[in-house]
């Protein structure tokens, strides 16, 4: 078996959720239901169990964030909650749905100068007055040797997109997160669906570049839902 498939190093890997298998059924093109992941020392299957306990946003799907389920609720119990749509209230970027970010407490549409919600994590921010640790899982803000003085080039390990050079975003790539190219016109993109086909987001693509959006490829309209190919297309 692969050793330490997902360890708890923040810049490289997602930490395992409390008492469960590593990874989380996020909504990604890399959905692979029922695959086996090491949870502790033995393999177990990952099902779409709800609610999903979490310690930080990066353990949740790309259209979810980690928080206490009730306002002023027990700070020691956090679960993955559905992201907030545009114009909804927020306290940090991760609360907003892909393509939006949190500005002045409201989710607003991203532009080229801001975070892209489908990739970014805000590991260093805590949720309101909640504690920044949960049963031993800290938010790990110390990155020691992995803090860079220069912007990361394609393929280098990163924590967030601001670590990467222009034209790159920080996206998960199996064992870690690395700087990947922002997608160009015609390239395959990942359209995140709100429900169903949840898989482990161990592989992410960047978002489409400026003036492009991720849409079903014209000649794939007749294909079955599962095999529809999305590509970056002009607005």
């Amino acid at each position: 078996t692969l050793n330490s498939v997902l360890n708890s190093n923040a810049i490289k890997n997602l930490p395992p959720p409390l008492g469960g298998a590593a990874g989380h059924p996020g909504s990604a093109v890399s959905a692979a239901p029922g695959i086996l992941y090491p949870g502790g020392n033995k393999y177990q299957t990952i099902d779409n169990y709800q609610p999903y306990p979490c310690a930080e946003d990066e353990e949740c799907g790309t259209d979810e964030y980690c928080a206490s389920p009730t306002r002023g609720g027990d700070a020691g119990v956090q679960i993955c909650l559905a992201c907030r749509k545009r114009r909804k209230r927020c306290m940090r970027h991760a609360m907003c749905c892909p393509g939006n970010y949190c500005k002045n407490g409201i989710c607003v549409s991203s532009d080229q100068n801001h975070f892209r919600g489908e990739i970014e994590e805000t590991i260093t921010e805590s949720f309101g007055n909640d504690h920044s640790t949960l049963d031993g899982y800290s938010r790990r803000t110390t990155l020691s040797s992995k803090m860079y003085h220069t912007k990361g080039q394609e393929g280098s390990v990163c924590l967030r997109s601001s670590d990467c050079a222009s034209g790159l975003c920080c996206a998960r790539h199996f064992w870690s997160k690395i700087c990947k190219p922002v997608l160009k016109e015609g390239q395959v993109c990942t359209k995140h669906r709100r429900k169903g086909s949840h898989g482990l987001e161990i592989f992410q693509r960047c978002y489409c570049g400026e003036g492009l959006s991720c849409r079903i490829q014209k000649d794939h309209h007749q294909a079955s839902n599962s095999s529809r190919l999305h590509t970056c297309q002009r607005h």
């Epitope: 692969l2 190093n9 040797s145 992995k146 860079y148 390990v157 199996f174 395959v188």
Partner: antibody
Framework: EVQLVQSGAEVKKPGESLKISCKVS????????IGWVRQMPGKGLDWMGI????????RYSPSFQGQVTISADKSISTAYLQWSSLKASDTAMYYC?????????WGQGTLVTVSS | QSVLTQPPSVSGAPGQRVTISCTGS?????????VHWYQQLPRTAPKLLIY???NRPSGVPDRFSDSKSGTSASLAITGLQAEDEADYYC??????????FGGGTKLTVL
């Protein structure tokens, strides 16, 4: 210029130990993963495992788990592949490669011959 | 036996177009994971040819292109040249977090 320079060819006997190296230059050693790939004579490529030199986090292919050890020394920007007890079937060319989005830079290879 | 299946050999005359297929399954290529292509010239280390989402490293001519559909991927080489004679390997990832290679395809330029 990114370069991965591997140690020279080795001829060993079964049961002997061996450690081959891959010296990296031209980029920050601790910002990319380094992988090892085996190519047996006349055969294809087999992924052995990968290491993140920043903290020595290592992943192995199930086929090579327990058979080899991958390590790295940050102070000299060098990755290693080692065997504690070689077998004749370990005879192969071994490549180190930088893992970016793909294996974007490769070493020249180290030929390991194990024969009694 | 490789997880990704490639034809052992393909051939073509100079100037022609050849394609090399790479067939996987729902736990690798079909899961949406990237497919990369490498060229290995005789007695040399492999070289990255195409990576990820149809990206070519600098120096790789646009005669080389790739495509992906379902659980398969393919590499196309147009305007075949004598120096293209080499072994070609596809590479992807498996849901078990393993790197997987195809068995390789020997391209002969007639």
């Amino acid at each position: 210029e990114v370069q991965l320079v591997q140690s020279g060819a080795e001829v060993k006997k079964p049961g002997e130990s061996l450690k081959i190296s891959c010296k990296v230059s031209g980029y920050s050693f601790t910002t990319y993963w380094i992988g090892w790939v085996r190519q047996m004579p006349g055969k294809g490529l087999d992924w052995m495992g990968i290491i993140y030199p920043g903290d020595s986090d290592t992943r192995y292919s199930p086929s090579f788990q327990g058979q080899v050890t991958i390590s790295a020394d940050k102070s000299i920007s060098t990755a290693y592949l080692q065997w504690s007890s070689l077998k004749a079937s370990d005879t192969a060319m071994y490549y180190c490669a930088r893992q970016g989005i793909a294996f974007d830079y490769w070493g020249q290879g180290t030929l390991v011959t194990v024969s009694s | 036996q490789s997880v990704l299946t490639q034809p052992p050999s393909v051939s073509g005359a100079p100037g022609q177009r050849v394609t090399i297929s790479c067939t996987g399954s729902s736990s690798n290529i079909g899961a949406g994971y990237d497919v990369h292509w490498y060229q290995q010239l005789p007695r040399t280390a492999p070289k990255l040819l195409i990576y990820g989402n149809s990206n070519r490293p600098s120096g790789v001519p646009d005669r080389f292109s790739d495509s992906k559909s379902g659980t398969s991927a393919s590499l196309a080489i147009t305007g075949l040249q004598a120096e293209d004679e080499a072994d070609y390997y596809c590479q992807s990832y498996d849901s078990s977090l393993s790197v997987i290679f195809g068995g390789g395809t020997k391209l002969t330029v007639l």
